[in-house]
């Protein structure tokens, strides 16, 4: 039960990529507004997105304080013109979100190939170390900073003239691969956290091919 003309939020869903984290829910409000609260399992509730008509709330600033914590959010529904009004139990109608542990669950954003350099029959491919919104000592940490040894990259590469793909893996942000002399290759990378059970892999990066601007070729 709740206040007349208010309905509880439902379908509370966490949308999170590289720790940018938004809670979404339904329904679109009709004559009601929402307030969101977030808490760790052992912490106090903190209110965000006060009396909003949106059906999403950016909770990034809260979860980046400790991405290894497990968070719970709840969405309160209030009548649009009377936010002091409460339900029959003496408090506004609300719905709980699923639990969310950013470190284990945030989606890995699409990586970018920063550069590639050919020296003879070797090519060094470097993946951009993407910045996250996690901070330490007032600086933003990179994806590698945050995930450390848990993060690997998979490189897919193939001759421009064929479709047969090869793969390589690295626990850094660099690959050194052998290529055939005189052949042009294309590259795509994927971020992977092998230890995860969900959201283990990012989408593939945009394809970059030799003979285009991003790379460098040196004949030794």
């Amino acid at each position: 039960s709740g206040t007349t003309n208010t309905v509880a939020a439902y379908n509370l869903t966490w949308k999170s990529t590289n720790f940018k984290t938004i809670l979404e829910w339904e329904p679109k409000p009709v004559n009601q507004v929402y307030t969101v609260q977030i808490s760790t399992k052992s912490g106090d509730w903190k209110s965000k997105c006060f009396y909003t008509t949106d059906t999403e709330c950016d909770l990034t600033d809260e979860i980046v304080k400790d991405v290894k914590q497990t968070y719970l959010a709840r969405v309160f529904s209030y009548p649009a013109g009377n936010v002091e009004s409460t339900g029959s139990a003496g408090e506004p109608l609300y719905e709980n979100s699923p639990e969310f542990t950013p470190y284990l669950e945030t989606n890995l954003g699409q990586p970018t190939i920063q550069s590639f350099e050919q020296v003879g029959t070797k090519v060094n491919v470097t993946v951009e170390d993407e910045r996250t919104l996690v901070r330490r000592n007032n600086t933003f940490l990179s994806l590698r900073d945050v995930f450390g040894k848990d993060l690997i990259y998979t490189l897919y590469y193939w001759k421009s003239s064929s479709s047969g793909k090869k793969t390589a893996k690295t626990n850094t942000n660099e690959f050194l691969i052998d290529v055939d002399k005189g052949e042009n290759y294309c590259f795509s990378v994927q971020a992977v956290i092998p230890s995860r059970t969900v959201n283990r892999k990012s989408t593939d990066s945009p394809v970059e091919c030799m003979g285009q601007e991003k790379g460098e070729f040196r004949e030794i």
Partner: antibody
């Protein structure tokens, strides 16, 4: 406050199995790797392997593969190490450990008090 | 499997500075090895000093500092105290496993 509390000493016969527990408190158990480390009498530290409780993902030192199994119970915040086919050279103190995480960091910051396993006929 | 090598023993005078090194048999130590330094005093439990190359634990005095110097990981201790006498272990990460060095017995004399 992060704490790792291990089970008590065990005296085992050769060929038997032993299961050691490591109960964690003061942090989100599922998100941190638990490391297992062996220290034989008068010897240095030797890494046995690790488990990430939230996903049950494990990694093992090749030397112990096949004889050691890690499990974790997230409902009780407890990690377990089972070592089978015990022999005299398994006599050692076994530690669980966890890293200190401040945005990024990995390894062996917090340690349990150790469990002495003695293998003797 | 890689071998991690440390000086078996070092001696430092009280108030002095000492550098402990950690070498890898596979080549240069990098930040991807996430070097750890663990202190173990006689008859005591191990205690983590540094993890992830240079991250001090909240209990680690600022007299200890971790870094990479050239091709090795180093632990530098400034202003040594007698209570710093211990065995110091280095551990390095290799893609899917940790390897501990044999330890350096540090004497403050």
């Amino acid at each position: 406050e992060v704490q790792l509390q291990q089970s008590g000493a065990e005296v085992m016969k050769p060929g038997a199995s032993v299961k050691i527990s490591c109960k964690a408190s003061g942090y989100t158990f599922s998100s941190y790797w638990i490391e297992w480390v062996k220290q034989a009498p008068g010897q240095g530290l030797e890494w046995i392997g690790e488990i990430l409780p939230g996903s049950a993902s494990t990694k093992y030192n090749e030397k112990f593969k096949g004889r050691v199994t890690f499990t974790a119970d997230t409902s009780t915040n407890t990690a377990y190490m089972e070592l089978s086919s015990l022999r005299s050279e398994d006599t050692a103190v076994y530690y669980c450990a966890r890293d200190y995480y401040y945005g990024s960091s990995y390894g062996f910051a917090y340690w349990g008090q150790g469990t002495l396993v003695t293998v003797s006929s | 499997q890689a071998v991690v090598t440390q000086e078996p023993s070092l001696t430092v005078s009280p108030g002095g500075t000492v550098t402990l090194t950690c070498r890898s048999s596979t080549g240069a130590v990098t930040t991807s090895n996430y070097a750890n330094w663990v202190q173990q005093k006689p008859g005591q439990l191990p205690k983590g000093l540094i993890s992830g190359t240079n991250n001090r634990g909240p209990w680690t005095t600022a007299r200890f500092s971790g870094s990479i110097l050239g091709d090795k990981a180093v632990l530098t201790l400034w202003g040594a105290h007698t209570e710093d006498e211990a065995v110091y272990y280095c551990a390095l990460w290799y893609s899917n496993h940790w390897v501990f060095g044999g330890g350096t017995k540090l004497t403050v004399l």
